[in-house]
Interface confidence: low
């Protein structure tokens, strides 16, 4: 092959980084460079020498080398927030190249404490019992106390304390959130005894009252989301779903969900009504299929929601963004490395997907032109491109026995996104592929059937 | 679903040591943070040590530099080495574990007795 300089990719986790590990790691990768001469180092966005840094062997792959470099930084240091990213920087006999590689935003956040009372004919059994329910959410880093007083003195039986998740988010620091019950008998509740969730967090303490005499008249809270048709779902499933999500419903038996059109013509629409939530309100969702060409051609949906306990009906519209640039993925695929091939345990094979524009994205591996179960795989979220705005880069991990890989078995990724011309592109590889092959097709559907 | 499987407890003389193991099974594709904790009678369960999917452990401050967390990532599976074990590290240890994306989920081993004498 013919020299060339190597192109740069920052490696971050596709998780922010926990905060209470003692340092983060993020990675450079470089890639399709030739003479194997390469040199990593790594600075600060102030241009001062970064020291912790592990380097990995380059690896031979059509004819051109790829290799990556490591940093640890001390999570303390992350965590001021001082620098967003910092700089990989190479050098090579064909050009020198640098990398911004942003860093997993570490934050302590508070934690916001709810107490949610049971309804009035919300106590069962003998004797009649029912449960507070007190959520801290938002906060960080994980460790956190929870602890119930029953009029200032401490509660010691009764109490479930779930363990601590962490909230679904698609950027920002990463937040946590934990549920602790309160098992109340009737008549303490209505003899007006005042119950407090007590949450201890980063050395401060949080506490949120309840009781009979303190419950406000239930207000309409009921709120209106109007989700659109993910990319993923009409590829897979060949129909533009709208999907209506009605929340805080005290009641169910009233509420009616419909979608109409531009032109006020009503779309038929399918409404499930979900079981009581822990907060004693339901949820329903109302979905109507309406034709792909009208949604991109930008056509208005009005989701209209009505409940008895509605003054008026709430309506919220959507339709297709405009003026979106549509930029088609690049994708990589990355043999085993051999450092883990030698130890032979388990092979991991990476689909990295790049440059692409909206960050609807869909991933699939194939093998032996069957899809593999995801349970095989895991697939980050897009993240932005650092330096190209409004960009965005994925990657995808499959991983297979040592065993399996050696036997010469091809494993195909299938990335699918609507900038591409037919929707879809692959690429396959396997023990003797040193490239990769690619392939732009269309007519996947007996794909996706299963 | 994520089953967790602990072994390795039991019963030590002051100074001695132990070594935990726990395997994850089931849907244990997206395992990211493997790790122990422990609760001793009529405290809360507390951090012990935990290693994340890219090898960086943490640890307690009262088992720093006497335990060693490890982990084997093609058999899914997070061991504690205890040593110089001491009557406070008396607790039922719990294997623990988080799985999925973007949600991640907690997952939680039935716990394993650790009883040091003095």
């Known amino acids: 092959g013919s020299a060339s300089a190597p192109t740069l990719f920052p490696l971050v986790s596709c998780e922010n980084s926990p905060s209470d590990t003692s340092s983060v790691a993020v990675g450079c990768l470089a890639q399709d460079f030739l003479p194997d001469s390469i040199t990593f180092s790594w600075k600060y966005k102030n241009n001062s020498d970064i020291s912790s840094t592990r380097g990995f062997p380059s690896v031979l792959r059509g004819g051109k080398y790829a290799a990556t470099s490591q940093v640890l930084l001390p999570s303390k240091d992350v965590m001021q927030g001082t620098d967003e990213h910092v700089v990989c920087k190479v050098q090579h006999p064909n050009g020198n190249k640098e990398k911004n590689v942003p860093l997993p935003v570490i934050a302590e956040l508070p934690p916001k404490v709810s107490v949610f009372v049971p309804p009035r004919d919300g106590f069962f059994g003998n004797p009649r019992k029912s449960k507070l329910i007190c959520q801290a959410t938002g906060f960080s880093p994980r460790q956190i106390q929870v602890s119930w007083l029953r009029e200032g003195k401490q509660v010691g039986s009764g109490v479930t304390t779930d363990q601590v998740q962490a909230e679904a988010k698609e950027s920002g620091p990463t937040t946590y959130k934990v549920t602790s019950t309160l098992t109340i008998k009737e008549s303490d509740w209505l003899g007006q005894s005042m119950f407090t969730c007590r949450v201890d967090h980063r050395g401060l303490t949080f506490q949120q009252n309840a009781s009979s005499m303190c419950v406000p008249d239930q207000d309409t809270a009921i709120r209106v989301f109007a989700i659109p048709p993910s990319f993923a779902s009409i590829f897979l499933t060949k129909s533009t779903k709208l999907t209506c999500l009605v929340t805080d419903l005290t009641t169910y038996d009233s509420v009616t969900i419909s979608w109409t059109r531009q032109n006020g013509e009503a779309v038929k629409t399918h409404t499930n009504i979900s079981e009581s939530h822990p907060n004693a309100t339901f949820s329903a969702v109302g979905e109507a299929s309406i034709c792909e060409d009208d949604w991109n051609s930008g056509e208005r949906f009005t989701c209209t929601v009505t409940h008895t306990d509605l003054p008026s009906p709430l309506k919220q519209t959507i339709s297709r963004p405009k003026g979106v640039a549509l930029h088609r993925p690049d994708v990589y695929l990355l043999p085993p490395a051999r450092e883990q091939l030698n130890l032979r345990e388990s092979a991991t094979i990476t689909c990295l997907v790049t440059g692409f524009s909206p960050a609807d994205v869909f991933v699939q591996w194939m093998q032996r032109g069957q899809p593999l179960s995801p349970e095989k795989y895991v697939t980050s979220a897009p993240m932005p491109e650092p330096q190209a705005p409004g960009r965005y880069f994925a990657h995808s991990i499959l991983t297979v026995s040592e065993e399996e890989w050696n036997t010469g078995e091809t494993y195909t990724c299938v990335v699918a996104h609507e900038a591409l011309p037919n929707r879809v592109t692959e690429r396959t590889v396997d023990k003797s592929t040193e490239g990769e092959v690619s392939a732009d097709e269309e007519g996947f559907e007996n794909l996706w059937a299963t | 679903c994520v089953q967790l499987l602990e072994s390795g407890g039991g019963l030590v003389q002051f100074g001695g040591s132990l070594r935990l193991s726990c395997a994850a099974s089931g849907n244990s594709f997206s395992i990211s943070n493997m790790g122990w904790y422990h609760q001793a009678p009529g405290k809360e369960r507390e951090l012990v040590a935990i290693?994340?999917?890219?090898?960086?452990?943490e640890y307690a401050a009262s088992v720093k530099g006497r335990f060693t967390i490890s982990r084997d990532y093609a058999k899914n599976t997070v061991y504690l080495q205890m040593n110089s074990l001491q009557p406070e590290d008396t607790a039922v240890y719990y294997c623990h574990c988080e799985s999925g994306f973007p949600t991640l989920i907690a997952y939680w081993g039935q716990g394993t007795q650790v009883t040091v004498s003095c």
């Open positions: 290693i994340t999917s890219g090898g960086v452990a």
